[in-house]
Amino acid sequence: AGVFELQIHSFGPGPGPGAPRSPCSARLPCRLFFRVCLKPGLSEEAAESPCALGAALSARGPVYTEQPGAPAPDLPLPDGLLQVPFRDAWPGTFSFIIETWREELGDQIGGPAWSLLARVAGRRRLAAGGPWARDIQRAGAWELRFSYRARCEPPAVGTACTRLCRPRSAPSRCGPGLRPCAPLEDECEAPLVCRAGCSPEHGFCEQPGECRCLEGWTGPLCTVPVSTSSCLSPRGPSSATTGCLVPGPGPCDGNPCANGGSCSETPRSFECTCPRGFYGLRCEVSGVTCADGPCFNGGLCVGGADPDSAYICHCPPGFQGSNCEKRVDRCSLQPCRNGGLCLDLGHALRCRCRAGFAGPRCEHDLDDCAGRACANGGTCVEGGGAHRCSCALGFGGRDCRERADPCAARPCAHGGRCYAHFSGLVCACAPGYMGARCEFPVHPDGASALPAAPPGLRPGDPQRYL
């Protein structure tokens, strides 16, 4: 476990021409705040993918009002560090997104308004416990200067915060096979604890809580032998051996949850629901009471009345989980409609809407036809965030700019012949038929069939004949 720390040094216009306009004005004073999002690895991930390593939001900076006529200076910044705690190992390589947000403090209807001023992103290698790394990133005409570092929280040490240190039990040396903890020479490395139940013969770990299998073994605890029978399994050959993996058990098969925990499958893996008094990924941490301080992030521990309720954590706003170990990402409530992008700003949820949609939750389909003209007498029909034109006769295409063959749809009934005409089309009817589309038979006595109902309709039905 540890903390990633980010220190913003300055945010202001970058060098070169085209200095940006100040984001604040006398009419609209504003202040800045920052959001950092961390993801493990060096993958080029979309801005909206989850901040799997964590995220943090800064405090608000001082209120700033532009001096008329002055160029945008470096803007006043919030005090303090942005801190992103991580519970597991520090990955060493990570991706970051730092967003600069503006809070407008004018007379907004419904309170202050937020807007994204700049977003920078990057991919870096960083060892925990190292010195501050300095960086400069540009976003358009803006420049952001910042430093960052990752540090381990005791008792963890090392470049990945995976080695654990304990005070020496004897003053002279550490136990068998355990090294002193540099730079804390008066402490010793604690033995590595693999995932509970990890097979001692067929499994091993390089980080606490993991269980990696030796060749020929599989399963979450390395207790399942890899089948060496002929490859009939739909899974195909295993890369680890010449044999095949037996068809994969479901993530809850064999119930990986210890201590009476119940397993439920999730799209990506499984989740253990632990009885009170147990916690951990597989309910493997046991016998916990409030005296053990099981509630993270300032959660309030309340002792239960019976053994099944050894404790319960009442989480502060912003945290959830049996032990308040998870940061609440309120975007997981899926509040944004019509493909809007959700931003949990800590104090509020914001939806960034796709083109054609608006509203706090992107629920309003904008008038797609506003400002859109359909040529040649076409009429605009809106829907689904995109406009389309219903074209007048003789025209087609997205905006009715293309000439269409009006006779292509064979509009003349009863063998009538169609002629394209500048005003549309003309039907030359076969003998015995009449009407704009040759739709009406002519009576033998020469009278038109117009007053009578077409076949299949009773006289008096409210049909209009054209």
Epitope: T266, E271, P317, Q320, L333, Q334, P335, R361
Partner: antibody, heavy 117, light 107 residues
């Protein structure tokens, strides 16, 4: 039209497990989170938490941590509520409800769970 | 947690009456205040969301208002089908919380 159809009533003994289903239709299931609400006999409504239908990640209110589990079968547009180690105080009607970004706009008809020895 | 209080647990009114049901929050919050109707058969429906917006298909005799900590639901012309229990709910801060409910009966 939008519908949430829940499984039928359940009669269970203390210590047993129950799993209630909520089948959604009339909309894209993975676009809206699903929420669960408890109503004890003669009492008001109590929000239990939600599950993100895109990722499967649940969130539980404090009183529903431990024995309660939300899960999904996305291919069947179905959400589940599982209650383990049932107690008498779990006797209630449980509702699933869709969240539209403002409020819980459509609700299931409710599933009655009775726990009695 | 934000506590929601509906001081009137039951209310009698005559058909055609204008009925107002109130709800108070323990702390100031934004307008994510919603009203639900639970019929005697147990079915629950959303009536009003975001303080004053009418959910689709809900008759226009229902309206909502309020801000800060005090909110109300008004039925302008009571009909027989409005016999139900009405709950307010805040959706601003987790955990979401409901009022205790107001049961509406006909005199």
């Amino acid at each position: 039209q939008i519908q949430l159809v829940q499984s039928g009533p359940e009669l269970k003994k203390p210590g047993e497990t129950v799993k209630i289903s909520c089948k959604a239709s009339g909309y894209t299931f993975t676009d809206y989170s699903m929420h669960w609400v408890k109503q004890a006999p003669g009492k008001g409504l109590k929000w239990m938490g939600w599950i993100n239908t895109e990722t499967g990640e649940p969130g539980y209110a404090d009183d529903f941590k431990g024995r309660f589990a939300f899960s999904l079968e996305t291919s069947a547009s179905t959400a589940y509520l599982q209650i383990n180690n049932l107690k008498n105080e779990d006797t209630a009607t449980y509702f699933c409800a869709r969240y539209d970004g403002y409020a819980m706009d459509y609700w299931g008809q409710g599933t009655s769970v009775t726990v009695s020895s | 947690d934000i506590q929601m209080t509906q001081t009137t647990s039951s209310l009698s009114a005559s058909l055609g009456d204008r009925v107002t049901i109130s709800c108070r929050a323990s702390q100031d919050h934004s307008n994510y205040l919603h009203w639900y109707q639970q019929k005697p058969d147990g079915t629950v429906k959303l009536l009003i969301y975001y303080t004053s917006r009418l959910h689709s298909g809900v008759p226009s005799r229902f309206s909502g208002s309020g801000s800060g900590t005090d909110y109300s639901l008004t039925i302008s012309n009571l009909e027989l089908e409005d016999i139900a229990t009405y709950f307010c709910q805040q959706g601003d801060m987790l955990p979401w919380t409901f009022g205790g409910g107001t049961k509406l009966e006909i005199k």
